[in-house]
């Protein structure tokens, strides 16, 4: 996160860290807890690393430096990458992770509400992006979970800024005209959440951007509302019943 500040314990209890253990262990992506046994993240996090057993998912944590060999983590039972995602394209950057064992909810570890299907009418004015990613383009992973308040921008405005790419209706953009605040490398897959009527909702999944926090280059996020059918289909067919945290 560029231009952010330290988060507090329990402030973003749905935020998880997706880490890979090969020779060493490192944080690669963020993710959002959406049910006892489900995490929503970006499909591109698994490019070149599709093997379930190399991944460790840490939930209910604030500081990555607090992780030791004794820190509990979740393992992956199943990775469900959107069927239309292609490594050679930037569309449908969304994936579900089914955990091997369900998590108990606590003050520091609980799910984020999902938006309503095709939610286009809600005007979100209080949106935040969180993650342990770089604090500048040529930076490094941060120890303490960072947060930053970023306004949504219209897809029309976003398309003007990214003429070489197609900004689809299944994407949502956020950023300041002057730059300075944005997600960055290592924040991929993490949440863009907005507070509406007193409730936090998962509006976007951190996907891509041209550099980080550059002027007139907003961050691009997978629009969760556009994938509600897919999310429900995959979680229901795997569970027999939905265990998602949907809005009231």
């Amino acid at each position: 996160i560029v231009g952010g500040t330290n988060s507090s314990w329990g402030e973003w209890p749905w935020q998880v860290s997706l880490q890979v253990k090969l020779t060493a262990q490192r944080h690669l992506c963020g993710g959002s807890l959406i049910g006892h046994q489900w995490v929503l993240t970006a499909a591109h996090c698994f490019d070149g690393l599709p093997l379930q057993d190399v991944w460790r998912i840490y939930s209910g944590i604030l500081n990555l430096s607090d992780i030791t060999k004794d820190t509990p983590f979740s393992q992956i039972k199943e990775i469900i990458i959107h069927q239309n995602y292609k490594v050679s394209e930037g569309n449908h950057d969304i994936a579900l992770i089914k955990l091997q064992a369900p998590l108990n909810y606590t003050e520091f570890q609980k799910p984020i509400c999902l938006p309503s299907k095709g939610d286009t009418s809600t005007i979100y004015t209080n949106c935040w992006v969180t993650g342990w990613g770089f604090s500048k383009e040529k930076g490094e992973i941060q120890n303490i979970l960072q947060k930053v308040n970023i306004p949504l921008v219209t897809n029309e405005e976003c398309q003007k800024r990214y003429q070489d790419y197609k900004i689809t209706q299944r994407m949502v953009c956020a950023g300041y005209k002057e730059g300075g605040k944005d997600a960055c490398k290592g924040d991929s897959g993490g949440p863009l959440v907005c507070k509406h009527n007193g409730m936090w909702r998962l509006v976007g999944i951190t996907s891509w951007g041209e550099g980080c926090a550059r002027r007139e280059q907003p961050g691009v996020y997978t629009k969760v509302a556009e994938y509600m059918d897919w999310i429900l289909e995959k979680t229901q067919s795997s569970d027999g019943k939905a265990q998602m945290q949907s809005p009231a």
């Epitope: 050679s88 394209e89 930037g90 950057d93 997600a183 996907s207 891509w208 041209e210």
Partner: antibody, heavy 125, light 108 residues
């Protein structure tokens, strides 16, 4: 199977014109940026031009700017390169290439993942 | 424009040997925009490595890419007879997209 098939090359006099075509198949053409890359005899590769999926935005190498025009017809799955005011130094094999633009580490990627077999353009009097 | 300089110009090696090809860029290049291609005489180039280190589909694991910033490397761990060809690095970080001049890997 992704296939790119160039046509339209040949011998042309300096100052003349030629239109190259590239017929694409095996993928959703309208989803991909496309490009032309050329290679003069015995020389290295040189990017010529690229065009976004919608066709609404193009890029050119300085060496061809104002003389060459890239375009596409998504309904026909075809990429074009209109070459005007041709010079001897434009003599080359012209390749049509698909531009893959994925995502990695919260940034886009960009590379030529599929190439046609090339068509030879010879500019000589 | 970003200039890519490949070295050496020619690499004379025997099958089974290790080949190390260098590509230096005149400006910082985001590794996501650095690719390597192989070209054999009379053929179109073939993608080997994208994003500086990711192998393209169907490329044997003896090919590997590494590097960041302005220094990139293509390594062929054990040369097979079919690996003798010309190799190009390429950046698409900034237009004009540019290629290195190529490194020819020839049989010693």
């Amino acid at each position: 199977e992704v296939q790119l098939l160039e046509s339209g090359g040949g011998l042309v006099q300096p100052g003349g014109s030629l239109r190259l075509s590239c017929a694409a198949s095996g993928f959703t053409f309208s989803d991909y940026m496309m490009a032309w890359v050329r290679q003069a005899p015995g020389k290295g590769l040189e990017w010529v031009s690229s065009i976004v999926p919608s066709g609404g935005h193009t890029h050119y190498a300085d060496s061809v700017k104002g003389r060459f025009t890239i375009s596409r017809d998504n309904s026909k799955n075809t990429l074009y390169l209109q070459m005007n005011s041709l010079r001897a130094e434009d003599t080359a094999v012209y390749y049509c290439a698909r531009v893959a633009r994925g995502i990695a580490a919260r940034s886009r990627t960009s590379y030529f993942d599929y190439w046609g077999q090339g068509t030879l353009v010879t500019v000589s009097s | 424009e970003i200039v890519l300089t490949q070295s050496p110009g020619t690499l004379s090696l025997s099958p089974g040997e290790r080949a190390t090809l260098s590509c230096r860029t005149s400006q910082f290049v985001n590794s996501n925009y650095l690719a390597w291609y192989q070209q054999k005489p009379g053929q179109a180039p073939r993608l080997l490595i994208y994003g500086a280190s990711s192998r393209a589909t169907g490329i044997p694991d003896r090919f590997s890419g590494s590097g960041s910033g302005t220094d990139f490397t293509l390594t062929i761990s054990r040369l097979e007879p079919e690996d003798f060809a010309v190799y190009y690095c390429q950046q698409s970080s900034r237009t004009p997209w540019t290629f290195g001049q190529g490194t020819k890997v020839e049989i010693k």
